[in-house]
Each structure stands twice: as C-alpha cells, then as structure tokens.
C-alpha cells in the first residue's frame, strides 16, 4: 500500500509544496513520484519514505506516489488545487446619462481566477450588494438590472470578486473594479413654457422668458434660445427643480416678417423644445403735414395725416373716410387757431394684435396787431385820489409792443396801480406795434374833482 501526505493541498499559483510518499513495506524495491511538475527530493529520506518539494505549481495537478513492495505494486495521488485571484475585474462603462425611471443594466467581466467553484461576483452600489452570482465562463460575465431613481445620481457602482477558500485558507480574497459614477437625469415630457411678445417692433427691445419645471439635476440643464438666426443670451435662474431663462431681444429691419422663436432645454442626452411665431414689424410714427407751419390769418391750410400703408388713421379723433392710412382737412386760419394742435393717431394690425402710434403738430397763425374796445377801452373816468390800474391789452402774433403817450411824451402806466391826479387827465395815443405793422387807438382819461359841500 502506498501513502501520500498531504492527500489534498490548496496553494497559491506558482507556489511550492512538500509531499511525502511512503510505502507500507519496510524495504520497498522502488519508491517514487510521478509528476510533470519540477520536483526536488529532500534528503535524507527514510527506508520506506521520501519527501519531495514540488515548485512553481501553475495549475491543478495530481502528482502520483508509487511503491513496489514484495506483495505487489501500488500508487496514491495527492490533489493539488491552485488558487489565484482574477487578473481583471471590470464594470462595463455606464451610459453618460441615465434617465430616471428607466432600468439600468450593470455588466461585469471577470478574467481568470480559480478555483471557480469558490469565486463569486458581486455588483455593488456603493457598499450595498445588488447581485451575487458565481463566475461562469472565461471571461465570466455577470449582469443585473436595477431601476434608477433621482437618488442614484452621483452613486458609485462597482464589481467585486470574492475568492472564499475558508476553512482551508483562513483568508477571503477580494478584488474590486474601478468604480463608475452614474449620472441620472429627469427631463419632463412637457415642453418648456415660452412667454414672449407675439409681435415685436423693429429697433425696440422685447423680453423672452422660457421656463420648465420637473428637471433633475437642474444645474446640469442647458437652455438654448433663438429668434430666427439670432442666438439669444439668456440669464438663467435655477429653482429646486425648475429653471427660468430670460433674454432681451432687439430686432432689425432685416428680420421683418414672421420669425420662429425657439427655446430648447437640454438635459442628459434629451431635449425638449417649444416654438412660437413672432411677427417682426416696422411702424414709423404717422406724419402730420401742414401746408405751412406758420401762416397769416385768413390763409387756407391743408392738414394732412399719413401713416404706414396698412394703418388706419384718425386726425384729431376723426377717422379717415374711408378708413385708411391718410386723412386730411382744410381750414381757414383764424387767430383762434394759433397754437392749435393737430393730432394724428395711427392703428396698425400686426398678426391680429393692434399697435398704436401718434404724432402731433402745432399751427402758428400770424395776426394783428389789434387793439379792441373790449381789451383797451377808449374812455376812463376816475375820481381824483382814487387807486386805479389802467388796462389796455394789445393782441397779435407775434405779440405787439404797446405804448400809450400823452403829447408824445407822458406815458400812461398800463397795468400799474396809480393814484389818480389831475396830471393823469388827457388824451393818450396808444400804439401797438409788431413786425406785422402797427395800430393806434385814442384813450381818454377823465379825472373827477371831489365835491365840497
């Protein structure tokens, strides 16, 4: 009978082991070991036993001890089991962005490692075990599917192998892959809300606001705002899970017509868009034309109001007949028309919305000078020593200068409070003079002496 010790050995790959072969008889005819492994006999042995050192054990092997005794030949095998940790434990790359609510498949590849019966593969979220499977195949591939929520954003996923040789080897061998960080996102199915003017006048500034709720992580969201070919530069305000992008837009005459306003919110690998039509229009203020802005009284004046060809105008609140872009009327200039305002209001319909403009012009009427009985009475009778204010108002445009003189030298103090004396009595020649000429009027002042009883 041939014996081998130890009958089973677990050793690391490339390791060495001492194996004792012994025969049951005292003087075996022959005693040895048969193995492809490099072996070295450790001397001295005994009459019926030999010790061998097997080195560089790379794979499982069954060295065989044999002995030849008088009662016959026999053999015995020792079982060498080689263990080694995997050479590669790798978690397949995660998608750059994973939508919340969609399942994520984790895939781990394990190359090498033995004995496979003692090798398990785990998929982990942080330190939490998601799945535990045995390694099968070369390379071994292990997969698991997990639901993804917002709380998985930034979570680390990894793959770990465990080579458990206990109780033979009092150690648990672990290999862990490089962790992969998951980026999750939530972009709602609703398009962004776009608030903007439906019509926008050339060379004026408008404000566009684009907002969207239910975004995660909101800080990663990007907003693109454009009007036609013009990219807008929005200021973005972030809320808990919402954003609002506000931009000013100024349009030029080249952009006149219908333009598309586009707001796109990009998150992860998805985009939500909203489009709106904006009508760009040009609407200069209407023109108010007077035949002449300054005329002499009695002159006929044509007041004309003209606006955008599609506009409807009103001149001093009176609609053009028929309604349209031009209105006019004729008037004979009177002094009362001096300083009169002529207002032209225009309404333009742009894509169903009404926009308004107006323009005002003033008429100057030249008249006078004029001295009327009403404003410059020809006769005053005042009691002596009373306080009086001589009044004489000259009218005209331009405003005339007024002088009232007695005997060409003595002035009547117009508009001043005076004490009536005998010297004030007499006839004054009042003269109103402007660039348009002069008029005169006689004014007599009578002074009543007090009666003494």
């Amino acid at each position: 009978q041939t014996s081998v010790f130890p009958p089973e050995v677990i050793l690391p790959r490339g390791g060495s082991v001492k194996v004792n072969c012994s025969a049951s008889c005292d003087q075996p005819i022959s005693l040895g070991m048969e193995t492809p492994l490099p072996k070295k006999e450790i001397l001295p042995g005994g009459n019926n036993w030999k010790m061998y050192e097997l080195s560089n054990v790379q794979e499982d092997s069954q060295p065989m001890c044999y002995s030849n005794c008088p009662d016959g030949q026999s053999s015995a095998k020792t079982l060498l089991t080689v263990y080694w940790t995997p050479e590669r434990v790798e978690l397949a790359p995660l998608p750059p962005w994973q939508p919340v609510g969609k399942n994520l498949t984790l895939r781990c590849q394990v190359e090498g490692g033995a004995p496979r019966a003692n090798l398990t593969v785990m998929l982990l979220r942080g330190e939490k075990e998601l799945s535990r499977q045995s390694a099968v195949g070369e390379p071994a591939e292990v997969t698991t599917t997990v639901p993804v929520g917002r709380d998985d954003h930034g979570a680390n996923f990894s793959c770990r192998t465990e080579l458990d040789l206990r109780p033979y080897v009092l150690k648990l061998f672990e290999n862990t892959s490089a962790p992969h960080q998951l980026q999750t996102f939530d972009l709602p199915a609703t398009p962004p809300q776009l608030v903007s003017p439906q019509v926008l006048e050339v060379d004026t500034q408008g404000t566009v606001v684009c907002s969207l709720d239910g975004l995660f992580p909101v800080s990663e969201a990007q907003v693109s705002l454009a009007l036609g070919d013009q990219k807008l530069n929005p200021t973005i305000t972030y809320g808990n899970n919402s954003l609002s992008a506000k931009a000013s837009v100024k349009v030029t005459a080249e952009e006149e017509g219908t333009q598309q306003l586009l707001c796109g919110v990009m998150l992860g690998n998805q985009t939500q868009e909203t489009r709106q039509t904006v009508t760009i229009y040009s609407f200069p203020a209407p023109n108010v034309n007077l035949t002449k802005p300054e005329v002499s009284e009695g002159t006929e004046v044509i007041v004309e109001c003209e606006a955008h060809p599609r506009a409807k105008v009103m001149l001093n609140g009176v609609p053009a007949q028929p309604p349209g872009p031009r209105a006019q009327f004729l008037l004979k200039a009177t002094p009362e028309d001096n300083g009169r305002s002529f207002s032209c209001s225009a309404t333009l319909e742009v894509a169903g919305q009404l926009v308004h403009k107006n323009q005002t012009r003033e008429l100057r009427v030249l008249y006078g000078p004029r001295l009327d009985e009403k404003d410059c009475p020809g006769n005053w009778t005042w009691p002596e020593n009373s306080q009086q204010t001589p009044m004489c108002q000259a009218w005209g445009n331009p405003l005339p200068q007024l002088k009232c003189l007695k005997d060409g030298t003595f002035p009547l103090p117009i508009g001043q409070s005076v004490t009536v004396t005998r010297d004030l009595e007499g006839t004054y020649l009042c003269q109103a003079r402007s660039t348009r000429g002069e008029v005169t009027r006689e004014v007599t002042v009578n002074v009543l002496s007090p009666r003494y009883e």
Epitope: R310, K312, M314, L315, P319, P323, E349, A351, L354, H356
Partner: antibody, heavy 122, light 110 residues
C-alpha cells in the same frame, strides 16, 4: 345697421357645413368681423376673425377645423368636418371700433346677429 | 395670449342689492375691455366699452372700472331683469390662439 346668421341645421358628423353672415348698413371693407359660438349651457367661445382686407386669425382649438371667408356683403364660416362637440349656436359679430379721445381703433363686438343653431348628431 | 379670468363663476343677489364681477387679463390690455350680458336664447348685449363707458340705452346702474389687467363691473340697485350671464371681452388682440372672453358670471336675482 344689422347682422344676421343663416345656414344652421342638423348635420351628421363629418358633413361639411357653411354658415353665412349677411350684413347691411355698413361696409365689410371698413370693418373686422368675428365668429363666436356657444355650446348649450356653456360660455362664449371666440372662433376667429376676418379683417377688412381679408386676413384671418383663429383660436388655437379652431385652427384647421374652421375657415372664414367673405364677399362684399357676407362673411362665411365653414366647418370642415363637424363633430358632436361642434353642436352650438353660432354668432357673427362686428368686431371693430374706435376711440376718438385717443384716436385709436380697437376690437369691440358692438353689433351681434341673433345666432344660428348647428346640431351635429349621428 | 391674453387669458381672461372672470370671477366669481356664479353670484346670488337680492333685488336692490349690489353685485361686483371681476375680470383679470394675463397681460395689460390698457382700457380695451367691454362687458356684455346675455339672457337665454338671446345674443350677448354690450353694456360697457372702453372699460368704463356706458353703451347707449344702458342703465347707469351698471358701472365699469379698471385698466391694465384688473377690471370690475358693478351693478347697483339690482333688478330682476338683471338676471343674466355676464362676460368680459378684451379688445386688444385677435391673434392666432387668442382668448377673447372671460368664462362668464351667472347672476341670480332673489
């Protein structure tokens, strides 16, 4: 000045229908005209408008379902493919006014027709 | 779009009482607002235009006020003939996709 609708009747779903609004006492070349409808027991719902020059604008829900056109004295509302939800009284209204104080025109339904009833039923 | 929000949807008032109906525009419509009332089987009748101007033949018991986005219709000394549905209408825009009328207010006179 008056406005009167006609053409309302009982139709089966999908049968095209045209309503006519006849105006008198004013010219359609000077005014905008709107169509408004009212389903039984419901509020007023603006359908669309035609301008003095013939431009048309529609409520978002009415786009593609209704077409407004006009002649010198009539304004037509065509219901392309009526459904039971289109059962309503249809009104035609003059929708244009001006304010002599500001000198501006604005939309205002100052003149209405009595309405015409459209019933869509299988 | 100019959304018109009318409140309340329904109101009950005693004869001789006062009723107030509010209309809010989502954007400024200046003073371009009209008020209508409608009785069953009849077309709407304009009561007030330009926010506060009384239409001809309309009782001075009806008073409109407001500008910009907030408007009010007040009916004082309510009569049984005032029982109707009241609507506000913006006169600023008839763009594609526009909202023109408020949702209406039913006035019930007790």
């Amino acid at each position: 000045q008056s406005v009167e609708e006609s053409g309302g009747r009982l139709v089966t779903p999908g049968t095209p229908l045209t309503l006519t609004c006849t105006v008198s006492g004013f010219s359609l070349s000077n005014y905008y005209m709107s169509w408004v409808r009212q389903a039984p027991g419901k509020g007023l719902e603006w359908i669309g408008i035609i301008s003095d020059s013939g431009s048309t604008y529609y409520a978002s829900w009415a786009k593609g379902r209704f077409t407004i056109s006009k002649t010198s004295t009539t304004v037509d509302l065509s219901i392309t493919s009526p459904t039971t939800e289109d059962t309503a009284t249809y009104f035609c209204a003059r929708d244009w006014s001006y304010d002599s104080t500001s000198g501006y025109y604005y939309y205002d339904m100052d003149l209405w027709g009595p309405g015409t009833l459209v019933t869509v039923s299988a | 779009a100019y959304d018109m929000t009318q409140t309340p949807a329904s109101v009950e008032v005693a004869v001789g009482g006062t009723v107030t109906i509010k209309c809010q525009a989502s954007q400024s419509i200046n003073s371009w607002l009209s008020w209508f009332h409608q009785k069953p089987g009849q077309p709407p009748k304009r009561l007030i235009y330009k926010a506060s101007t009384l239409a001809s033949g309309v009782s001075s018991r009806f008073k409109g006020s407001g500008s910009g986005t907030q408007f009010t219709l007040t009916i004082s000394g309510v009569e049984s003939a005032d029982a109707a549905t009241y609507y506000c209408q913006q006169g600023y825009s008839r763009s594609d996709g526009e909202h023109v009328f408020g949702g209406g207010t039913e006035v019930v006179v007790k």
